[in-house]
Structure formats: structure tokens, C-alpha cells
């Protein structure tokens, strides 16, 4: 199996994780995509997914997770707002392509959320932001459940994350409707 690497992000409660997952737009523009958490000893759980087929730039919100798939750019943006300590964990973007297995990202995100004041931007934070609003109208998509995983041999797209601090406090509901998805590595 391909060795998966990960990047560590240490953020404070209340901050926002902002991940950009690149993909080959000609192949995957309209494919359904998902954001998963991987806990030790467990299969990955899909926390949120885009619609099927994925709609261009149309935000999908599940609790405090917002997905935006930009077909024109080959980029899936994932935001987790108002981070809580219990959000700490290992995350990844995947691209669904049934009947084949999902394409997984090599660069997983190791998120560590700590308690503390997040009013002053830290070294990894975005201090140039002057407008940051959660879209008022979003769609929640149903995520598929895969049951026959095989080894992924082709390199999938990559992802990175940055962090930003909203101008105003964001209070959204916790993530709901978590769906189990088997490991694909």
C-alpha cells in the first residue's frame, strides 16, 4: 500500500481550518467528494460530502463543516469553523468515483485543537482577512457508503490547509449524521 503522509496543524478553539484539495479537473470536476476523519483502529468516517454530481462552487454545510467544490479550478475547499478541542484528529479529502474506490489524498491533515484565546492571529493564521461570513443557505448532501475496499495504487490529488480567524464569532451546530466508510489504503 502507498505510504500516506500527514501535515500537523495546531489551532486554537474558535478558529477555522481551511483546506484546499487539488484535483485533476478534467477527470474529477463533477465527481462527488468527501471530507473524512480517521480515528485509530477505526474505519474512516465521512463527515460531509458534496452533492452527486458535485455542483460548481455550491456550498454544502454539515454542522460546522462547509464544502465548496470549484470545478473551474479543480479545487475542493473544506472549512471547519469554530473549532473545538474534540475536533482534533486525522482528516482527509477523498474523491468518490463509483464503481471504483475513492481517490485518497497523500497529505492528510493532523489537526490539533487546543484551548486558548484566539483573538490575535498566530504565525500560521491569516491576518489579511477583512470579510468572513458563513453562507446563510447551504445544502446538505447524502454520502454514499462503500463496503468493498481495495488498495489504491494511483496517486490521488493533494491537499493543504490554512487557518483563519473569523471577524465575528461563529456558533454553528456540531457535526451530525456521521457515516462510516472503510479504509482505502
Amino acid at each position: 500500500a502507498t505510504k500516506l503522509t500527514e501535515e500537523k496543524y495546531e489551532l486554537k478553539e474558535g478558529q477555522t481550518l481551511d483546506v484546499k484539495c487539488d484535483y485533476t479537473l478534467e477527470k474529477f470536476a463533477s465527481s462527488q467528494k468527501a471530507w473524512q476523519i480517521i480515528r485509530d483502529g477505526e474505519m474512516p468516517k465521512t463527515l460531509a460530502c458534496t452533492e452527486r454530481p458535485s455542483k460548481n462552487s455550491h456550498p454544502v454545510q454539515v454542522g460546522r463543516i462547509i464544502l465548496e467544490d470549484y470545478h473551474d479550478h479543480g479545487l475542493l475547499r473544506v472549512r471547519m469553523v469554530n473549532l473545538q478541542v474534540e475536533d482534533s484528529g486525522l482528516y482527509q479529502c477523498v474523491i468518490y468515483q463509483p464503481p471504483k474506490e475513492p481517490h485518497m489524498l497523500f497529505d492528510r491533515i493532523r489537526l490539533v485543537v487546543t484551548k486558548g484565546f484566539s483573538g490575535t492571529p498566530g504565525s500560521n493564521e491569516n491576518s489579511t482577512q477583512n470579510v468572513y461570513k458563513i453562507p446563510p443557505t447551504t445544502t446538505k448532501a447524502l454520502c454514499p457508503l462503500y463496503t468493498s475496499p481495495r488498495t489504491v495504487t494511483q496517486a490521488p490529488p493533494k491537499s493543504t490547509a490554512d487557518v483563519s480567524t473569523p471577524d465575528s464569532e461563529i456558533n454553528l451546530t456540531n457535526v451530525t449524521d456521521i457515516i462510516r466508510v472503510p479504509v482505502f489504503n
Partner: antibody, heavy 116, light 107 residues
Framework: EVQLVESGGGLVQPGGSLRLSCAAS????????MSWVRQAPGKGLDWVAS????????YYVDSVKGRFTISRDNAKNSLHLQMNSLRAEDTAVYYC?????????WGQGTLVTVSS | EIVMTQSPATLSVSPGERATLSCRAS??????LAWYQQKSGQAPRLLIY???IRATGIPARFSGSGSGTEFTFTISSLQSEDFAVYYC?????????FGGGTKVEIK
């Protein structure tokens, strides 16, 4: 075919103002982040500002914050950059670009010269 | 701010030869890195994004690799139309930042 056509550049004195415009066609403007990137004569590329399709997120480089304002009119497929309190170091070709993080399509640019 | 450093500043290569350009980030940008080509008097053109994904319509002789802080851009066999200035750009964090550019010139 994607087309981005900038206008509004010209010669202005230090402390003066200019408003750049960009007419977009060939793609769904209202679904795309848009940005401005500039290039001083004989120099490299510098990102200036980015704006989300619905205006809910706007970002600026520190050197222009408080002086420049990016805006858009999705009904008219147009992007704007209001530049106030211009300085000599703002002299550059200003490009209108499609994208908010990386830039898939570029206009041909409009030259802004700040000089007394 | 993430500082992007490109090397060499100028690269002299003969047509048909391979050109290898380097880009280094002051901190990890994972794979959120793009490469652009700019010919004299023209606007830049996106060649590579996601460190290694070719943009639409870009010939296979252009390729990118790397992740984290070290990236490489390669033109496998230089054509006459490839002589230009090449820029890398990170889009992991705002402010978005470009490298200073590498000029690929005819040897």
C-alpha cells in the same frame, strides 16, 4: 473562450485615486473567485486582492489594506479595484485574474503609473 | 508571510535539452503550489497546480514535483516557445506569494 479585459489605468499623481475595471466573459463569473495581481516594470508578480463570488470573503496584501477596495458586480460580470492614496511603489501593470488562490485565466493588464 | 525563493535566477539551456527549476518555501505549503509561464510582453499562463497537476491544455513536457518546502519544475525537452520567465506561487495561506522568477534563456 475566457476573456478578461482591464481598463482604467493611467498616470496619476502620488496621493491620487484610480478605479480599475475588468469586463469578464466566457465563463460563469458569479461562480468564480476573482483577484487582482500586479507587476511592477521589470519586476515579478505580486498578489493584491481576492474576492469570493458572493463577496463574503475578501483578502488584501498588507501594503494596500485601507487604500485599495476590491468589488464586483455579478449582474454585469465586472470586477473593480478602487485605488486611493496611491504611491510611487504602486506603479505596475494590474492584471484581472480568475481564481482566488491560484490563477487560471489572466487579462492583458492595464498600466498604472504613479508619478509627479 | 510565506516567502518563496526560486533558483537559479537565470537558466541558459539549448533547445531540446532538459530544464530543471527549483522553488523553495520558507514554511510548508504542502502541495498548494502553482507554476506560471510569462513570455515577454504577455500575461502569465498557469502551467501546473497542486505541485504536479498539469493545467488544461498544457503539454506533457511540462511537469512538477515536490511537496512541503521543496519543489521542482521540469521541461523535458525545451522548445523554442518555452523560453520565458517561470514563477512559482503558493496558495496555502493568504497573503498569496510568488517566487522571484527564473528566466529560461537560449544558450
Amino acid at each position: 473562450e475566457v476573456q478578461l479585459v482591464e481598463s482604467g489605468g493611467g498616470l496619476v499623481q502620488p496621493g491620487g485615486s484610480l478605479r480599475l475595471s475588468c469586463a469578464a466573459s466566457g465563463f460563469t463569473f458569479s461562480s468564480n473567485w476573482m483577484s487582482w495581481v500586479r507587476q511592477a516594470p521589470g519586476k515579478g508578480l505580486d498578489w493584491v486582492a481576492s474576492m469570493k463570488q458572493d463577496g463574503s470573503e475578501i483578502y488584501y496584501v498588507d501594503s494596500v489594506k485601507g487604500r485599495f477596495t476590491i468589488s464586483r458586480d455579478n449582474a454585469k460580470n465586472s470586477l473593480h479595484l478602487q485605488m486611493n492614496s496611491l504611491r510611487a511603489e504602486d506603479t505596475a501593470v494590474y492584471y484581472c485574474v480568475r481564481g482566488g488562490w491560484r490563477f487560471e485565466s489572466w487579462g492583458q493588464g492595464t498600466l498604472v503609473t504613479v508619478s509627479s | 508571510e510565506i516567502v518563496m525563493t526560486q533558483s537559479p535566477a537565470t537558466l541558459s539551456v539549448s533547445p531540446g535539452e532538459r530544464a530543471t527549476l527549483s522553488c523553495r518555501a520558507s514554511q510548508s505549503v504542502s502541495s498548494n503550489l502553482a507554476w506560471y509561464q510569462q513570455k515577454s510582453g504577455q500575461a502569465p499562463r498557469l502551467l501546473i497546480y497542486g505541485a504536479s497537476i498539469r493545467a488544461t491544455g498544457i503539454p506533457a513536457r511540462f511537469s512538477g514535483s515536490g511537496s512541503g518546502t521543496e519543489f521542482t519544475f521540469t521541461i523535458s525537452s525545451l522548445q523554442s516557445e518555452d523560453f520565458a520567465v517561470y514563477y512559482c506561487q503558493q496558495y496555502k495561506n493568504f497573503p498569496l506569494t510568488f517566487g522571484g522568477g527564473t528566466k529560461v534563456e537560449i544558450k
